[in-house]
Interface confidence: low
């Protein structure tokens, strides 16, 4: 029958032959020889008292006698050892010379071909009657992974001839497979926290360990849940993992209290426009709980307002706000507070920020034009808007002409200095009609357009224009 | 001398198969595992599976539902058929033995000319 | 599976220059690692087995060292035959695996 054997030290540079998938380090290769007196088992029995599954009898194309039937040897069923130990096992078979055709023998556990990182090799005996193959199967340092049931297959005569399987079982210390984790709990809630350990050997048992002090005095079998009612402080928490081989302590893990988040810091304006200012911010530390939202504050920095504060809820992330529908040319003080499930933090450092100058709100008043034909060209005049100092300081004045006659459509505009609060345009077209709309212009930007002033340009001489700021739609008053 | 011989080119169209050949000769087919690699233009090189006459295949889990490697011991070839072809499979496909050193050290000391699978309706 | 990142990805030299490309495996190997060139338009050959063992036929310009999880290949004085591109392969178990390819071109 097959043996079984763990060892200690073995050099790896045994006999190997036949067509087998393995690998080994280049440094440790058998080689192919199929006779050698080194490291050899003393042939199997020839007798099958224990046959595993067995080629049936066939009958030969040339001899038309009946084959006897084959198959592997009785071996050792179960196999226990310690992990990092080696282990040796085989596989043999007795193949009389009747049978022609024969293929390697093949590794297998738990239902896969090992084509991978194992230790194989094939020994052959031939005597007069047949052969006898013997398969060494060998696993270095052995793991928890190498548990499992192992058998030889081969085929003979196009039959597979399969082994008894050979269950190897490693046992070790306990094995985690469900550590605690780190959670963040509300203060006197009760939370649970799983410790699952596994062998072989069962059975495995747990302690609980609350700060270096264990929490049961009784183990429990694992799988094991811990239930805390309730903490004041942080704690850390592990579990012990006990079974014959010895003990086993998890990672330890730290259960945090949730309180109110820190204020943010690092208040900062990244920019600022007539209107709006654009914040952003560090969050503070989150109090072991999500930030959900953030309460952007701003008030009126200056003496004479009346020191309400406007709120501006945002999302916690990104941690950034544009705060808009502020006054033009204002001071204002913004701070930013944080909350979480626990509640809201305290208010950043207040930091003060100021918006830019506006455009001007209003258009220019008292809006003429008037055709000079012996210059052919239009006479505009305005007066100026009332504008506030928010509005900032007048740089001049827009002014957009749009010629329409049949077929033709010219859009053009003009700029022009605050100094003065009329302007002269050559006359593009005859025979048509233009419309004139001015804007005041502060550093701010351009303000609104007045109403459109329409004036008919004639072929000759005669002129109808409209000498207001209202809107004129075709010709009003005639000159 | 060892050699490994690849028909030149496949044209083949999506969704079709492609059955590519790999005939072997100045060596006993059936003592090594034949091995099939892929290689798309300018990329590098992809270990499909391996097969060996006597004993069985083994695939990249990636291929196995692409590939079906097969041997003809009577002619000493090698087969891979590939199927349900998109663009993706557009490459030139290698039959490569592993080395006589020893039976599991599977690198390759002879290739073959390699095989360009070009997808395209 | 086992990843096999190669480096450089490109090298450009001039003859006469010595090279070292380099194979990092993501798992002890035990230098079951080849190393192959590939000319443009042709098959990989083999150039190095076992990490160290030079191929039949190959120059002795060709050398290869490493352990565990660190190879690599060094070409001495550099020939314009030796122009093209370089994989280093594990064979430590299947799947096979190659490095994604250092090309080596002339300066």
């Known amino acids: 029958g097959g043996t079984a054997e763990k060892w200690e030290e073995t050099e790896l540079d045994q006999l190997f032959s036949g067509p087998l998938p393995g690998r080994l380090p280049v440094n440790h290769r058998p080689f192919s020889a199929p006779h050698s007196s080194r490291d050899q088992l003393p042939p199997p029995q020839t007798g099958r008292s224990h046959p595993a599954h067995t080629a049936a009898p066939q009958v030969t194309s040339t001899a038309s006698k009946l084959l006897p039937p084959v198959a592997f040897n009785h071996t050792i069923g179960h196999i226990v050892l310690s992990e990092h130990k080696n282990v040796k096992f085989n596989c043999s078979i007795n193949i009389p010379n009747t049978y022609q055709e024969t293929a390697g023998i093949s590794w297998w556990k738990d239902g896969k071909e090992l084509l991978g990182a194992h230790h194989s090799i094939t020994q052959f005996y031939p005597d007069e009657e047949g052969v006898s193959i013997i398969a060494l199967f060998s696993i270095a340092s052995v793991q928890r992974s190498d548990n499992g049931s192992y058998f030889c297959k081969m085929k003979v005569n196009n039959r597979e001839i399969v082994s008894d399987p050979i269950y190897v079982e490693v046992q070790g210390l306990p094995y985690f497979i469900k550590q605690p984790e780190s959670v963040n709990v509300t203060r006197n809630t009760a939370f649970n926290l799983t410790c699952q350990a596994v062998g072989p050997p069962e059975p495995v048992n747990i302690f609980w360990v609350q700060n270096s002090s264990r929490v049961n005095e009784k183990p429990e079998r694992s799988p094991s849940v811990l239930t805390v009612p309730g903490l004041t402080e942080t704690a850390v928490f592990s579990c012990e993992a006990h079974n014959d081989k010895g003990l086993t302590v998890s990672k330890g893990v730290h259960i945090n209290i949730k309180v109110i988040p820190s204020p943010p810091t690092e208040v900062h304006i990244l920019n600022s426009t007539a209107h709006s200012i654009l914040v952003s911010w560090v969050p503070g530390f989150d109090g072991y709980s999500p930030l959900q939202n953030c309460s952007i504050q701003v008030k009126e920095a200056d003496r004479l307002s009346n020191g309400s504060v406007m709120v501006f809820n945002t999302s916690a992330s990104p941690h950034l706000y544009e705060i808009q529908q502020l006054q033009a040319l204002a001071n204002y003080s913004i701070a930013v507070s944080c909350r979480n499930e626990i509640g809201w933090s305290a208010v950043s450092p207040w930091i003060l920020a100021s918006t830019t100058e506006g455009a001007p709100s209003v258009a220019p008043l008292n809006i003429t034009v008037f055709l000079n034909e012996s210059n052919n060209i239009l006479d505009i005049r305005w007066t100026k808007p009332p504008i506030k100092r928010q509005d900032g300081e007048l740089v001049g004045y827009r002014i957009s002409h749009v010629w329409e006659s049949a077929g033709t459509y010219k859009e053009l505009s003009e700029e022009v200095s605050q100094n003065g609060s009329w302007a002269q345009i050559p006359v593009q077209i005859h025979n048509a009609t233009c419309t004139v709309r001015i804007a005041a212009i502060t550093k701010g930007g351009i303000g609104p357009f007045s109403e459109p002033v329409n004036i008919i340009i004639p072929e000759h001489s005669k002129v109808d224009y409209a000498p207001s700021s209202t809107p004129a739609p075709g010709n009003t008053d005639s000159m | 001398q060892v050699q490994l011989q690849q028909p030149g080119a496949e044209l083949v169209k999506p969704g079709a198969s492609v059955k590519l050949s790999c005939k072997a000769s100045g060596y006993t087919f059936t003592s090594y595992w034949m091995h099939w690699v892929k290689q798309r233009p300018g990329q590098g090189l992809e270990w499909i599976g391996m097969i060996h006459p006597n004993i069985n295949t083994n695939y990249n889990e990636k291929f196995k539902s692409k590939a079906t490697l097969t041997v003809d011991i009577s002619s000493s070839t090698a087969y891979m058929q590939l199927s349900s072809l998109t663009s993706e499979d557009s490459a030139v496909y290698y039959c490569?033995?592993?080395?006589?050193?020893?039976?599991?050290?599977?690198?390759?000391?002879?290739w073959g000319t390699g095989t360009t699978v070009t997808v395209s309706s | 599976d086992i990843q096999m990142t190669q480096s450089p990805a490109s090298l450009s030299v001039s003859v006469g220059e010595t090279v070292t490309i380099t194979c990092r495996a993501s798992e002890n190997i035990y230098s079951n690692l080849a190393w192959y060139q590939q000319k443009q338009g042709k098959s990989p050959q083999l150039l190095v087995y076992a990490a160290t063992n030079l191929a039949d036929g190959v120059p002795s310009r060709f050398s290869g060292s490493g352990s565990g999880t660190q190879y690599s290949l060094k070409i001495n004085s550099l020939q314009s035959e030796d122009f093209g591109s370089y994989y280093c392969?594990?064979?430590?178990?299947?799947?096979?695996?190659f490095g994604a390819g250092t090309k080596l071109e002339l300066k």
């Open positions: 490569a033995k592993r080395s006589p050193y020893s039976n599991y050290d599977w690198y390759f000391d002879v």
């Open positions: 392969q594990h064979f430590w178990g299947t799947p096979l695996t």
